[in-house]
């Protein structure tokens, strides 16, 4: 009897949908695996007789519940199927946005770039998929614990009237208010402000 794949799960970030599993202990030799998806009531092969422990399902429709399954094989024997259900638009993890930061005197000017999507045109981003897409920004004075959060209305934001000659750190994430779903934070970007722009009287 061939044992089934273990710890079968979907690892999906920005609709890059990778079905992953672990190979069970099997004394007779090396196992291969077949992964399938349900399409119009028929299971279709996606990865056949692979020695890998993952299979790319990024070409699935972003909408709807998909039934995926994987089994282990050895010679003419095979395990039972292990099934999972996956809805990309609900289940995919929102990866960190890009961010450009520029210092202008005592201000930080930030521009945000929505994450790109696997198997899509360059210009079709997570912002196109989710109508309620917005950004959360948090910033703090470097070396302090207190963090401030803002929700920009646009793809850019300016933090004004900051302390001069002080290093501030900023990070951004995507947020979907209608789903109350937050994405992953970007890596902090830390920049030092320069002089105060106000002219002495």
């Amino acid at each position: 009897m061939v044992p089934p794949p273990e710890n079968v799960r979907m690892n999906s970030v920005n609709f890059k949908n990778i079905l992953q599993w672990e190979s069970p202990a099997f004394a007779k030799g090396n196992l291969t695996f077949t992964a399938q998806y349900l399409s119009y009531r028929i299971f279709q092969d996606k990865c056949m007789n692979t020695t890998l422990t993952e299979c790319d399902f990024s070409s699935l429709s972003k909408y709807g519940d998909h039934t995926l399954r994987v089994r282990a094989e050895f010679a003419d024997e095979h395990s039972d199927w292990v099934n999972i259900t996956f809805c990309p638009v609900d289940d995919t993890i929102i990866g960190p946005p890009g961010m450009q930061v520029e210092v202008l005197a005592d201000s930080l000017h930030m521009r945000f770039l929505a994450p790109k999507i696997e198997n899509e045109y360059e210009t079709w981003t997570m912002k196109n998929v989710y109508n309620s897409w917005t950004y959360n920004v948090q910033y703090w004075k470097n070396g302090t614990d207190e963090k401030f959060q803002i929700t920009p209305q646009y793809d850019f934001e300016v933090l004004r009237n900051l302390e001069p000659w002080t290093t501030y750190c900023v990070q951004v994430r995507g947020f979907l208010p209608d789903r109350n779903k937050a994405g992953e934070w970007s890596e902090p970007v830390c920049e030092q402000t320069t002089h105060d722009e106000t002219v002495p009287s």
Partner: nanobody
Framework: EVQLVESGGGLVQPGGSLRLSCAAS????????IGWFRQAPGKGLEGVSC????????HYADAVKGRFTISRDNSKNTVYLQMNSLRAEDTAVYYC?????????????????WGQGTMVTVSS
């Protein structure tokens, strides 16, 4: 259920232009994304372009960027693909497709309804 009918294909010389039309029965605004795809002889289906109904944003495959322009006339329930500077490698059957959920643009899996296609041949 929407029905899509493509027209405007034909034979054109390299460097020439064509405008494809995709007429949708019913209200095309019910379908948030309309896309154009093509299938060259002996090749797989390839995304060309799409247009979003809500904000009218347009998106293109690298191979056609700067040469093709997608547009839509909601009053006529029609989407157009203006193809300029045509090349031999643009020869294909061109299909129009509509997405009911509008979540995707390039992947055929994200489209629910398809036209029958119109043939474009670029040859001298």
């Amino acid at each position: 259920e929407v029905q899509l009918v493509e027209s405007g294909g034909g034979l054109v010389q390299p460097g020439g232009s064509l405008r494809l039309s995709c007429a949708a029965s019913g209200n095309s605004l019910d379908y948030p994304t309309i896309g154009w795809f093509r299938q060259a002889p002996g090749k797989g289906l390839e995304g060309v372009s799409c247009i979003s109904a809500s904000e009218g944003s347009t998106h293109y495959a690298d191979a056609v960027k700067g040469r093709f322009t997608i547009s839509r006339d909601n009053s006529k329930n029609t989407v157009y693909l203006q193809m300029n500077s045509l090349r031999a490698e643009d020869t294909a059957v061109y299909y129009c497709a509509a997405s009911g959920h509008g979540l995707g643009c390039k992947s055929e899996a994200d489209y629910d309804y398809w036209g029958q296609g119109t043939m474009v041949t670029v040859s001298s």
